[in-house]
């Protein structure tokens, strides 16, 4: 019996060298959010704690910015940033809600061609 729902930006694509905002939103519950963790596959990117604020993992400090809100901004994107990202909401009293976002980082030329040409 689920009480809340996580809404995410879903599958998104961005250009190499650019930036992207990862956003999740927890709705349909009155539970209090105590902490949100952001993970890239098997790596912890950032933590937003209701009392302690934001902590960015040292290995991502140069390319990850907190916010807006409980979201996360990834900067200077590389093709290696392609993959799954997870927002993990810890709430009281419900428990933990997890949302998934798939990010594809495209080479600049691919992104440009995709915008200019249509395949019949």
């Amino acid at each position: 019996m689920m009480t809340g729902t996580i809404e995410t930006t879903g599958n998104i694509s961005a250009e190499k060298g650019g930036s992207i905002i990862l956003q999740c939103h927890l709705s349909s519950t009155t539970a209090q959010v105590t902490q949100v963790n952001w993970e890239q596959q098997d790596q912890l990117l950032a933590i937003c704690n209701a009392d302690l604020g934001w902590h960015i993992s040292p290995s991502f400090k140069d390319r990850v910015a907190p916010g807006p809100g409980l979201g996360l901004t990834l900067q200077s994107l590389t093709v290696n940033d392609t993959g799954e990202y997870f927002c993990i909401y810890h709430t009281y009293p419900d428990g933990t809600y997890t949302g998934r976002i798939f990010l594809e980082v495209l080479e600049s030329s691919v992104a440009e061609h995709g915008a200019r040409f249509q395949i019949p």
């Epitope: 009480t3 098997d42 790596q43 912890l44 997870f86 419900d94 428990g95 933990t96 809600y97």
Partner: nanobody, 127 residues
């Protein structure tokens, strides 16, 4: 196939302690939602505590109000075992305790629907 085997139940006096163990096989996902539930004589199933873990390092535990501060859920990754440390036990904690695991981690909490269950272990708190 996922299999869960509990152990550690028994008879304990009020105020005493017990540690339950749940050995899992076949449950090898990078994100895990596991928990402990109990059923007291003549009553329905109650969620006691759940634990969300990921290979990215996230570790979130949740407790029912009735056990918060007295029970602690933990795990040993190397043994793929889940534990429930129960302190300051009361007569009302008497129940069959079940270990459970969930396939999806979209929601992990005492009110979630779990997919796999152990056979249960009896905890009796009595003087």
């Amino acid at each position: 196939e996922v299999q869960l085997v509990e152990s550690g139940g028994g008879l304990v006096q009020p105020g005493g302690s017990l540690r339950l163990s749940c050995a899992a096989s076949g449950y090898t996902y990078s994100r895990k939602c596991r928990g402990w539930f109990r059923q007291a004589p003549g009553k329905g199933l109650e969620g006691v505590s759940t634990l969300y873990t990921s290979s990215g390092g996230t570790y979130f535990d949740t407790y029912a109000d009735s056990v918060r501060g007295r029970f602690t859920i933990s795990r040993d990754n190397s043994k793929n075992t889940l534990y429930l440390q129960m302190n300051s036990l009361r007569a009302e904690d008497t129940a069959v305790y079940y270990c459970a695991a969930r396939l999806s981690t979209d929601f992990c909490g005492p009110r979630a629907d779990f997919d796999y269950w152990g056979q249960g272990t009896l905890v009796t708190v009595s003087s």
